[in-house]
């Protein structure tokens, strides 16, 4: 049977650390971290760390019992936790039978928004007390609500991470731009800005509050050429105030309307 890992919390030092070992396994060859989305019973999503590691392909893995992973998180407060992943079988080969290094992973450290994490991992039995132990470490900074995975966090959803306003903006004439967008059930106040290098127009939008998405339209006066300008839509939801996720679009020319057929240049103009 191929070895797998069984992981569980281990807060203090590993018991092997107190023992003298003539030989110890080598260090890890690689350590990686990425956030993953997992569903929880409440129907909400939990964002966890997927920590994966690769074993060095040599005979020292015959001594390997476990790998210990510890994570320190630094944001508003500091957190620290460790797991010990025991190998279920002794290694009979230095590489997987199908080829490639032995690779394992553990999913389980919760990930908060915009937090710096320090992840350290070492093999067990580790080096003796007065020796430098082979270990691997890396820093991982979790992204914010714009990330394709983090956007599912409850805090991000309440800030509008899953809201797609589907902004369209077009230049009606030299003086006005029409902006259309889909509203969010999270709130009813929005600010639409038109800017090139500077702000050339803006408008507050207040829609009647309703618990469904509707299409809103606003015509914004502009002070200069607007074609190619950027539209920024800022929502003001109760949960995030003025710190909600902003969305952008680009001003294009409005399609011509009310012209049923192209003008025929040969036809005489009325009243001529």
């Amino acid at each position: 049977r191929e070895p797998t890992v069984q992981c569980g919390s281990e807060t203090g030092p590993s018991p092997e650390w107190m023992l003298q070992h003539d030989l110890t396994p080598g260090d890890l060859r690689d350590l990686r971290v990425e956030p993953v989305k997992t569903s929880v019973a409440t129907g909400d999503y939990s964002i966890l760390m997927n920590v994966s590691w690769v074993l060095r392909a040599d005979a020292s893995i015959r001594l390997l019992k476990a790998t210990k992973i510890c994570v320190t998180g630094k944001s508003n407060f500091q957190s620290y936790s460790c797991v010990r992943c025991n190998y279920t079988e002794a290694f009979q080969t230095q590489t997987r039978p199908s080829g490639g290094k032995w690779t394992f992973s553990y999913i389980g450290f919760p990930v908060e928004l915009n937090t710096v994490y320090f992840i350290g991992a070492h093999n067990i039995p580790n080096a003796n007390m007065n020796e430098d132990g082979p270990s691997m470490s890396l820093n991982f900074t979790s992204p914010g609500c714009l990330d394709h995975i983090m956007k599912y966090k409850k805090k991000c959803v309440k800030a509008g991470s899953l809201w797609d306003p589907n902004i369209t903006a077009c230049k009606k004439n030299e003086e006005t731009v029409e902006v259309n967008f889909t509203t969010s059930p999270l709130g009813n106040r929005y600010m639409a800005l038109i800017q090139h290098s500077t702000i050339i127009g803006f408008s507050q939008v207040s829609e009647p509050y309703q618990n469904k998405q509707t299409r809103a339209s606003v015509v914004i006066p502009v002070t200069e050429e607007s074609e190619g300008a950027m539209v920024q839509l800022t929502p003001y939801f109760p949960t995030c105030g003025s710190d909600c996720i902003r969305h952008k679009g680009t001003v294009v020319l409005c399609p011509q309307t009310g012209v049923p057929f192209p003008l025929d240049n040969n036809r005489s103009k009325p009243g001529g």
Epitope: L23, A57, L63, T95, S98
Partner: antibody, heavy 118, light 107 residues
């Protein structure tokens, strides 16, 4: 059955390079490390390095690190060893040897004699 | 690097003799040791790995023992086809090194 077939004998001048090939058959090429071992005339065996055909990870003997290049082509199940800046004391038989479960050398090529002479 | 010291470097023996070759590692190699047989003009052939395990097709008159740093290859009853050079090799992590070899000659 497992077979490792090496390229033919080479005669090279000092300062030149030589590239030896080792074609594997009878097993899944990417599942085992391939080692290179050389033996000078009347001398013992010397490990030069190894390559993992799965991902091309290479570990060299420090003695050869600056002069040896190990590569592989998985499409034709072939490993290569190139030794540059040849000297007369590089005259030897060069063997490819496939690792077993760990790095004992379960299967060997027939050897390639490289003669370095001016 | 781990040094492998083999002794004797050569020996003379007769068919039917019991032959013992020793190999000492400069540090503990945790039984990660292999033995090879090589005949003139041929590639080495694996005899034993993990000290005691016989490779495929190797006769049972070959056996190995030892642990830590000291290891032994024994041929219980020497046969005519056994006259060759024998090498030990450690595989306790790269770089792998071989013993200097023991040439077994006909007395």
């Amino acid at each position: 059955q497992v077979q490792l077939v090496q390229s033919g004998a080479e005669v090279k001048k000092p300062g030149a390079s030589v590239k030896v090939s080792c074609k594997a058959s009878g097993y899944t090429f990417i599942s085992y490390w391939m080692n290179w071992v050389r033996q000078a005339p009347g001398q013992g065996l010397e490990w030069m390095g190894r390559i993992d055909p799965y991902d091309s990870e290479i570990q060299y003997n420090q003695k050869f690190k600056d002069r040896v290049t190990m590569t592989r082509d998985t499409s034709i199940s072939t490993a290569y060893m190139e030794l540059s800046r040849l000297r007369s004391d590089d005259t030897a038989v060069y063997y490819c040897a496939r690792s077993g479960g760990f790095d004992w050398f379960a299967y060997w090529g027939q050897g390639t004699l490289v003669t370095v002479s001016s | 690097d781990i040094q492998m010291t083999q002794s004797p470097s050569s020996l003379s023996a007769s068919v039917g003799d019991r032959v013992t070759i020793t190999c000492r590692a400069s540090e503990n190699i945790n039984s990660n040791l292999a033995w090879y047989q090589q005949k003139p003009g041929k590639a080495p052939k694996l005899l034993l790995y993990d000290v005691t395990n016989l490779a495929d097709g190797v006769p049972s008159r070959f056996s190995g023992s030892g642990s830590g740093t000291d290891y032994t290859l024994t041929i219980s009853s020497l046969q005519p086809e056994d006259f060759a050079t024998y090498y030990c090799q450690h595989f306790w992590g790269p770089p792998y090194t071989f013993g200097g070899g023991t040439k077994v000659e006909i007395k």
